[in-house]
């Protein structure tokens, strides 16, 4: 995990200023409004049952 201004986060992750660490882009499916998701490629929508079980 990197501080801002150093090497970028590893592939598949993005820096979260809110959490002060690199976060997995995969979690943007569950938490799409997280700040780090702006640095991730558009996440696919969650399966129907995850959003509205």
């Amino acid at each position: 995990e990197q501080a801002p201004g150093t090497a970028p986060c590893s592939r598949g992750s993005s820096w979260s200023a809110d959490l002060d660490k690199c976060m997995d882009c995969a979690s943007c499916r569950a938490r799409p409004h997280s700040d780090f998701c702006l640095g991730c490629a558009a996440a696919p929508p969650a399966p129907f049952r995850l959003l509205w079980p």
């Epitope: 598949g12 882009c25 979690s27 499916r29 569950a30 696919p44 049952r49 995850l50």
Partner: antibody
Framework: EVKLEESGGGLVQPGGSMKLSCVAS????????MSWVRQSPEKGLEWLAE??????????HYAESVKGKFTISRDDSKSRLYLQMNNLRAENTGIYYC??????????WGQGTTLTVSS | DIVLTQSPASLTVSLGQRATISCRAS??????????MQWYQQRPGQPPKLLIK???NLDSGVPARFSGSGSGTDFTLNIHPVEEEDAATYYC?????????FGGGTKLEIK
Amino acid sequence: EVKLEESGGGLVQPGGSMKLSCVASGFTFNNYWMSWVRQSPEKGLEWLAEIRLKSDNYATHYAESVKGKFTISRDDSKSRLYLQMNNLRAENTGIYYCTGGFADYFDYWGQGTTLTVSS
Amino acid sequence: DIVLTQSPASLTVSLGQRATISCRASQSVSTSSYSYMQWYQQRPGQPPKLLIKYATNLDSGVPARFSGSGSGTDFTLNIHPVEEEDAATYYCQHSWEIPYTFGGGTKLEIK
């Protein structure tokens, strides 16, 4: 240091009720999805219930086996998680873990509290 | 519900060798980009501990001797080189949909 501490387990008769509590510290409780997971020799690890965030209107989800019987709730002001369990049966016996995750995984686990349903 | 089947149920590995644990899902838990599979370690008398999330991503503080791979329905946890402290039961867990489910566990013994 992250800490989750469950309480409220014990012995209860079939058909009885019990409320489990979990107090959290060391992380931003109100930004974490919280769940209860049960472990028993018969069924292994079973996810039971989840409660999301205030921004999700505290959406709750349940395993089919506990739907209508168990109710999960949280109090962000006290960093507490609860599980109200009604109409308990022998198959509800097990170790109940309070767990927290930023998203759809379980980052943090308590040590567990044991519930025994028996006459 | 998605059923996760782990194999083997138990295995014994010599110190310093490789342990390989498999988890098969009854349906795909992957998109084109990500796989929604986690791995946990549970030592006797302790709660489970997150090792790997989203199939390949090590949780913070987890030693690099642990690695995860796979996509779709077939996933693998590798431990190499195995150390004595790795003696534990390992579980997979999917987060593709609700209900989340766990595998039945694989007990790893070290000789």
